[in-house]
């Protein structure tokens, strides 16, 4: 008889997930040689660890720390960028303006980047099926717990001048509750970090209005102000010029250093 | 390193036309949105035209549109201005100009500059 | 469009600061850059992106950009620093503006 399991309403775990994270983690490893003396099974097991056997709405951070020690990795703390609803657009940008990083440019983000992944309550199983979505179910969901500790951990970090792309086609340009609006800005360091820079991509190519007037972002410019950080927003036209790069990123079209 | 060679300015009558040409090299031109910029003797610098890398997306400057057309052959590594109708307000050192990478909307390099005289 | 203004002229004695402005609405919502032009020659980028340097160019040139006004900086101003600068911005579109131009002398 097969056993009764909880339906949720998200999408269940990725297909392949062990293997998917285990040969991200092989790849970033052989890649970046600052993360050289990672080992991949240990790391497997700690993600597992974080959410096996567990149920999948009482998920909490503390589950995670195992994972987050082995992830521990130093990025350049002034040369992050954060995004938000604009992810493929920022990773082009990182991709060819190598001295930058988002999240998912660091091991832990790159391990999960568009991955989903659940498990049942006292069984070993991995919830292929289904998995709890985040508004529909429950928020304390393995995914979202393990974004919202990473974001805030990347967030700790950065230094200086950070910089967010936000989108400048959506109606909600800066939406509070965002990973960036509900995490990441409020986990902005004051005694280390100067300045937040947003860049406002625009996506019409005859667009010329100023996206940095728009109220979200003045709602934005106030909770920082209110942290004691400095803002400043930027228009950013002709966002083909990233795409460009990604054909060519060997290119010298693609770093910002003139 | 970048060079940026203009041609093709000269002496010519009100609603004549003139092609300028700009020679690219040291650099992957193809890869670069590239502009005109002329100064009128004695003026300031005046925005024309800018052409994406692959040529798809232009852009004019009201004074000049409807009369200037630009346009790129990357394969020959040069930037065209296709001038008609042209006035003698037109007068003025033309410049071809390389734009700045990624988030930044500036001209790194210019060329030194042909000279169009408009008059009868 | 954006209009960026200038002042024609600025003098500085050698070896002290000269500070040349350019002022637009809301301009600091832009990306600003500075170029220097010596008579019968091209223009030559010194600041772009507001305050970045390219390579080549001397320390001594500084820039900023808060509120409705940029400002190209010369600190320790030298005979040779004597030329037409303009600075430029790019509020999308068609929309490529440049300022009038500021004469700097060198006294």
């Known amino acids: 008889v097969p056993r009764w399991r909880q339906q949720w309403s998200g999408p269940g775990t990725t297909k392949r997930f062990p293997e998917t994270v285990l040969a991200r983690c092989v790849k970033y490893t052989e890649i970046h040689p600052e993360m050289r003396h990672v080992d991949c099974q240990s790391v497997w097991d700690a993600f597992k660890g974080a959410f096996i056997s567990k149920h999948p709405c009482n998920i909490t951070e503390e589950d995670y720390q195992p994972l987050m020690k082995l992830g521990t990795q130093t990025v350049p703390c002034n040369k992050i960028l954060l995004w938000s609803r604009i992810k493929d657009l920022a990773h082009q940008f990182t991709q060819v303006q190598r001295d930058m990083f988002t999240l998912e440019d660091t091991l832990l983000g790159y391990l999960a980047d568009d991955l989903t992944w659940c498990g049942e309550f006292n069984t070993s199983k991995i919830n292929y099926q289904s998995c709890p979505d985040w508004r529909k179910d429950c928020s304390n969901n393995p995914v979202s717990v393990f974004w919202k500790t990473v974001s805030r951990r990347f967030a700790e970090a950065a230094c200086d001048v950070v910089h967010v792309m936000l989108n400048g086609s959506r109606s909600k340009i800066f939406d509070k509750n965002s990973t960036f609006g509900s995490v990441e800005v409020h986990n902005l360091q004051p005694e280390k970090v100067q300045t937040l820079e947003a860049w406002v991509i625009h996506g019409g190519r005859e667009d010329s209005r100023d996206l940095c007037q728009d109220p979200t972002i003045k709602e934005l410019e106030s909770i920082i102000s209110k942290r004691n950080i400095q803002f400043s927003c930027k228009n950013i036209y002709r966002p083909d010029k990233f795409l460009q790069c990604v054909k060519n990123p060997e290119d010298s079209s693609c770093t910002s250093e003139i | 390193q970048v060079q940026l060679v203009e041609s093709g300015g000269g002496l010519v009558q009100p609603g004549g036309s003139l092609r300028l040409s700009c020679a690219a090299s040291?650099?992957?031109?193809?890869?670069?949105?590239m502009n005109w910029v002329r100064q009128a003797p004695g003026k300031g610098l005046e925005w024309v035209s800018a052409i994406s890398h692959d040529g798809n997306v232009k852009y004019y400057a009201d004074s000049v549109k409807g009369r200037f057309t630009i346009s790129r052959d990357n394969s020959k590594n040069t930037l065209y201005l296709q001038m008609n109708s042209l006035r003698a307000e037109d007068t003025a050192v033309y410049y071809c100009?390389?734009?700045?990478?990624?988030?930044?909307?500036?001209?790194?390099?210019w060329g030194q500059g042909t000279l169009v005289t408009v008059s009868s | 469009d954006i209009e960026l203004t200038q002042p024609p002229s600025v003098s500085v004695a050698p070896g002290q600061t000269a500070r040349i402005s350019c002022s637009g609405d809301n301009l600091r919502h832009y990306y600003v850059y500075w170029y220097q032009q010596k008579p019968g020659q091209a223009p030559v980028l010194v600041i772009y992106g507001d305050s970045k340097r390219p390579s080549g160019i001397p320390e001594r040139f500084s820039g900023s950009n808060s509120g409705n006004t940029a400002t190209l900086t010369i600190s320790g101003t030298q005979a040779e620093d004597e030329a037409d600068y303009y600075c430029?911005?790019?509020?999308?579109?068609?929309?490529?503006?440049f300022g009038g131009g500021t004469k700097l002398t060198v006294l």
């Open positions: 040291g650099f992957t031109f193809s890869s670069y949105y």
């Open positions: 430029q911005t790019y509020t999308g579109g068609a929309s490529l503006v």
């Open positions: 100009a390389r734009d700045l990478p990624l988030v930044y909307t500036g001209f790194a390099y």
